[in-house]
């Protein structure tokens, strides 16, 4: 094959090599960029910056090598468009630092930075941590800071991510109230901070105020839906990012729903209860307190992490006619109480008979050869035979 005269030449089926001295000053408009998985660049002293726009369209890129070039700066978001990047070799350039944000979100198996005049500072604390934890092949490189000795020896006592304190009201919050949250940010070299409110949806009207180091957030006209929703304050500095999530408890009275009994291998009277704080529950059977046992007891389904409503069953293991009757669920919290009742009939009374029927002599024996009644314990060992959708 004839030698390739261009600045960049194909290498294999999806690779590109750019090794002609000084031919590149940026990575715009590389040929066949959208299908590239490997890009090798060498001897490009004019290539000094690597930014977001440089790698746009290189979505398939897995290996990137830029060596023996003039790279001085890599933007924190440079690799936003190359999420599949797994090997990054930036050795023998002019890099003094590299932000933690640059590699955030990538699953780098290899990161090579040897031969750069790195400047030891808190901004490289993340790289020091990679070295300590044996990540990305960093320990083998024995990285040095220019004129400062090994990266591993860099003092890091003061290199911490921001510290966040979120103040929430300690008084009870009721539906319709306005709630003021304040996020105090402390730390060195603070860069950015803000609120993440993705879970709130229609739970309140949101108004942000203030800026570093004290961020305010007003949640106006809150609803009960705000319960169990995360309100997150975040802040970043050159060391990394910190987040603190809080939840605002909005008080509201207990409510309860009962549904018709359903038969599994056991019986279930499905219920839903709601309220904040979580209501206490009590069952009545025909008006009297029902004492729960291993044959009749309350069983909750796994709660959804982001809502207060709880679903469950009054579970009855092989109930008989003595369990037929009126079941009432009482739910109460400091803001109110509620109840719901349902009639349940599990089995006819074998001792009730019509005078015209033949008189039973004794309790009929069960067919001793029957195997159809054998229950099967599910392999996942959960006592629920089927899921019951309630509410």
């Amino acid at each position: 094959a004839a030698p390739c005269p261009d600045a960049c030449c194909p290498h294999g089926s999806s690779g590109l090599r750019c090794t002609r001295d000084g031919a590149l000053d940026s990575l715009h408009h590389l040929p066949g960029a959208e299908n590239l998985t490997e890009l090798y660049i060498e001897n490009q002293q004019h290539l000094q910056h690597l930014e977001l726009r440089d790698l746009r369209g290189l979505g398939e890129l897995r290996n990137l090598t830029i060596v023996k070039s003039g790279l001085r700066f890599v933007a924190p978001d440079a690799f936003h468009f190359t999420p599949r990047l797994s090997r990054l070799n930036l050795s023998f350039n002019a890099l003094e630092s590299l932000s933690w944000k640059t590699v955030q979100g990538l699953s780098l198996q290899e990161l090579v930075l040897s031969g750069n005049p790195l400047h030891c500072s808190c901004a490289l604390r993340w790289l020091q941590r990679w070295e300590e934890e044996g990540l990305g092949g960093v320990p083998e490189q024995k990285l040095q800071c220019h004129g400062q000795g090994p990266l591993a020896h860099m003092p890091n006592a003061s290199c911490g991510v921001p510290t966040l304190k979120v103040q929430v009201p300690n008084a009870s919050v009721d539906v319709g109230d306005d709630v003021l949250l304040r996020c105090q940010v402390e730390g060195r070299g603070l860069e950015q901070a803000g609120w993440i409110l993705t879970e709130l949806e229609q739970s309140a009207t949101v108004m942000k105020s203030g800026g570093l180091p004290s961020l305010g957030l007003t949640l106006a006209n809150v609803t009960s839906d705000l319960n169990r929703k995360n309100v997150t304050c975040w802040a970043e500095n050159d060391v990394g990012r910190a987040e603190v999530s809080v939840q605002v408890n909005v008080s509201f009275p207990a409510s309860v729903q009962l549904h018709t009994a359903v038969e599994m291998h056991h019986w279930c009277i499905p219920f839903s209860v709601d309220g904040q704080p979580a209501p206490s529950l009590r069952w009545l059977f025909n008006g009297s307190v029902l004492n729960e046992t291993s044959f009749i007891f309350t069983e909750f389904l796994e709660p959804a992490a982001n809502e207060t409503v709880r679903h469950g069953c009054l579970r009855l293991n092989q109930p008989t006619h003595v369990n037929n009757g009126n079941y009432t669920l009482l739910a109460a919290n400091p803001f109110g109480q509620a109840s719901a009742s349902i009639m349940a009939a599990f089995m006819d009374n074998p001792f009730e008979f019509n005078p015209e029927d033949p008189i039973p002599v004794s309790f009929s024996p069960v067919d001793t050869n029957s195997t159809s009644g054998d229950p099967v314990e599910k392999k996942d060992e959960t006592p629920f035979g089927v899921s019951v959708a309630v509410g």
Partner: antibody, heavy 117, light 109 residues
Amino acid sequence: QVQLQQPGVELVKPGASVKLSCKTSGYTFTSYWMHWVKQRPGQGLEWIGEIYSSNGLTNYNEKFKNKATLTVDKSSSTAYMQLTSLTSEDSAIYYCARHWYVFLDHWGQGTTLTVSS
Amino acid sequence: QAVVTQESALTTSPGETVTLTCRSSTGAVTTSNHANWVQEKPDHLFTGLIGGINNRAPGVPARFSGSLIGDKAALTITGAQTEDEAIYFCALWYSNHWVFGGGTRLTVL
């Protein structure tokens, strides 16, 4: 597979207390009730009580109400029975047994408690 | 408290059918008593066999079956085997507590 593991032997002095353990594995501990049963030679089996591992709800045989206290540790999937003011009458084998549906289906191998000075 | 009574001992031969019974001092055993049958083998190895009168526990051989016969709970072993030699305890549920019978020692000769 479902397993209920109990220490083989406990030796304690009269008047003291003891906490017997039943460490479970192979199933979702919090979904089941655990029962405790006493066996004395020549006296058959006596039911002591039951506990719901999910919330610690208990029911006791009247005879053992002031003798036994049942608890659970969800983090280690372990059921416990504390026996207090021990006398020679408490010397016996104590079993934990899992309740599933209408069965006492899986039993521990028992802890032999000896109360002796 | 109720008393639950079982035969103290029974003997059968391999291949034969044998029935063990369980009587309640409070009257007829009913489905509300959720009669359980538990097998004890040497070295204190207990296994639940039958629950709720006639439900076999998972993994229990089909030769074991439970029923109500008259006013008693019954455990029938159809085609007994030598490994069935054991002590069999009946347990009855009385609303909020179990009461065990004294056990039947079954010998398979």
